[in-house]
């Protein structure tokens, strides 16, 4: 990491250090320690205090972003005396050089695109690099395929999401021969960034009085079961006057997804299409291909 760490400490130092790769804050163990505590304060004066590790001379921050700059602090009491030490973690580099407008989305169940824009004050030779760490911090994923704009990395395509977990830490570092480039980091939930495919295997079967629509839930990256889905059906009578309201029907997910509605013969030509969403977020997929049923002379 290019960020410089500055220590603010009394004469006898705890030698506090921070490893941004593991998000681990550690310090020199003191004999006869009676009390230890570590925390960080961000630029908005929010305080995050994680649990101490078993050895009590380190702590790991799980869900934090560092790009706005933070101050770490360690308090240790021993039977003899008390220690306090601050560690400033600034985002060094010229202001406005970090990647901006960062966003990612998962699509087709196993692909992900992330995009960003170059910082407004970044020099021409700036180059950005994306690293992703899952919440278990077991491994770091480096971007395998960069999307480029005039040679500068402005996006990333991943076709293997096996290293991700439900919440992931994204870091965009920058380099330049001219000046220091600030980094940008973000925590993203996979469930909030996934765009579902529309439902598959949509069929319509009609008898003399009713029509039954069936479909299969879309394959998703997230591990969702049938109750986690919400569906919307658009049943549309063909050749109606412009401005006529479509019938939008909400259906909760079930083991066998079906919707039965009254429609007696002779029936006019209709079309039906379906879209899907996570029931908690209602981030709708695109519509499935329209399926037609009925006849023109109905």
């Amino acid at each position: 990491e290019k960020s410089d760490l500055r220590t603010v400490a009394p004469a006898s130092s705890l030698n506090v250090r921070f490893d941004s790769r593991t998000m681990n804050l550690s310090w020199d163990c003191q004999e006869n320690t009676t009390f230890s505590k570590c925390f960080l304060t961000d630029k908005k004066n929010r305080v995050v205090e994680p649990r101490l590790s078993n050895n009590e001379c380190s702590c790991t921050f799980r869900e934090i972003c560092l790009h706005e700059g933070v101050t770490f602090e360690v308090h240790v009491n021993t039977s003899q005396r008390g220690f306090q030490q601050k560690l400033l973690y600034p985002n060094s580099g010229r202001e406005g050089t970090a990647a901006q407008n960062f966003s990612c989305f998962i699509y087709n169940a196993d692909l992900m695109n992330c995009t960003w824009a170059r910082g407004p004050t970044a020099p021409r030779d700036v180059q950005y690099f994306l690293y992703i760490r899952n919440s278990k911090r077991r491994r770091e994923i480096r971007c395998p395929y960069y999307i480029q704009d005039s040679g500068t990395h402005v996006g990333c395509h991943l076709d293997n999401l096996s290293g991700l977990t439900s919440r992931n830490y994204f870091l965009v570092n920058g380099t330049s021969r001219e000046i220091g480039i600030q980094f940008f980091d973000s925590l993203l939930d996979t469930k909030k960034i996934e765009r579902f495919n529309p439902p598959s295997n949509v069929t319509v079967r009609c008898n003399t009085t009713h029509c039954l629509v069936r479909w299969k839930q879309p394959r998703t990256y997230q591990k969702l079961s049938y109750l986690d889905f919400q569906y919307q059906l658009d049943v549309h009578r063909k050749n109606t006057q412009p401005g006529t309201e479509n019938l939008l029907i909400n259906v909760s997910g079930d083991l066998e997804n079906r919707y039965n509605f009254p429609s007696s013969e002779p029936r006019a030509k209709h079309s039906v299409k379906i879209r899907a969403a996570d029931v908690r977020i209602l981030n709708w997929s695109s519509w499935s291909e329209a399926i037609e049923f009925g006849s023109d002379d109905g």
């Epitope: 439900s166 969702l224 079961s225 109750l227 083991l255 066998e256 908690r280």
Partner: antibody
Framework: QVQLVQSGAEVKKPGASVKVSCKIS????????IHWVRQTPTKGFEWMGG????????VYAQRFQGRVTMTEDTSIDTAYLTLSSLRSDDTAVYYC?????????????WGKGTMVTISS | QAVLTQPSSVSGAPGQRVTISCTGS?????????VSWYQQLPGTAPKLLIY???KRPSGVPDRFSASKSGTSASLAITGLQADDEADYYC???????????FGGGTKVTVL
């Protein structure tokens, strides 16, 4: 209509093992997550384990670790629960259930249950 | 000892409204993980009544409703009927146990 059909009641001696089956009809087991829960009059419901898609493996409750094995035969859409080193307090109704939602784990539907009695 | 705490029994006259509480902790309901509610009639398997804290599966009447706040949840039954007489259980996920946890159950009696 999806149904879970469980094997019949069992009477076992302490120290023995029991294997309970759960046959899924109306749906493919490979598309589902099955969990096992037992119920006793004294302890109520106890979650025993089941398939965790996040880990892509079957996970077990800590208190049954080492004594319980859950397996699946997707070719015949059947899940199995084996509990070994049986004790009298393992006397319970054992249920299999489909995970309907991974958010908080909601179960629907459940099998009718298999009564397992441990008696010397 | 059940991880989630419920009253052992509640009762009400036909047509009345009854509520059942379910208290958990910061590692389950307050984590926050979703709460489900089940109805168990004597000698039968549990039936899912509520999932995602307040959603009803198809076939469950709207007389059953639920809510969640902080580390506790509650189930309400309005227009109490004779066939609502059953045991009701709350359930959630617990991160410290890495699995499902249940309440001890509440017996609903229709007077």
């Amino acid at each position: 209509q999806v149904q879970l059909v469980q094997s019949g009641a069992e009477v076992k001696k302490p120290g023995a093992s029991v294997k309970v089956s759960c046959k899924i009809s109306g749906h493919s087991l490979s598309e589902l997550s099955i969990h096992w829960v037992r119920q006793t009059p004294t302890k109520g419901f106890e979650w025993m384990g089941g398939f965790d898609p996040e880990e892509n493996e079957i996970v077990y409750a800590q208190r049954f670790q080492g004594r319980v094995t859950m397996t699946e035969d997707t070719s015949i859409d059947t899940a199995y629960l084996t509990l070994s080193s049986l004790r009298s307090d393992d006397t319970a109704v054992y249920y299999c259930a489909i995970v309907g939602s991974f958010s908080g784990l909601a179960y629907r539907p459940w099998g009718k249950g298999t009564m397992v009695t441990i008696s010397s | 000892q059940a991880v989630l705490t419920q009253p052992s029994s509640v009762s009400g006259a036909p047509g009345q409204r009854v509520t059942i509480s379910c208290t958990g902790s910061g590692s389950n309901i307050g984590a926050p993980y979703d709460v489900s509610w089940y109805q168990q009639l004597p000698g039968t398997a549990p039936k899912l009544l509520i999932y995602h804290n307040n959603k009803r599966p198809s076939g469950v009447p709207d007389r059953f409703s639920a809510s969640k706040s902080g580390t506790s949840a509650s189930l309400a039954i309005t227009g109490l009927q004779a066939d609502d007489e059953a045991d009701y259980y709350c359930q959630s996920y617990d991160s410290s146990l890495s699995g499902s946890v249940f309440g001890g159950g509440t017996k609903v009696t229709v007077l």
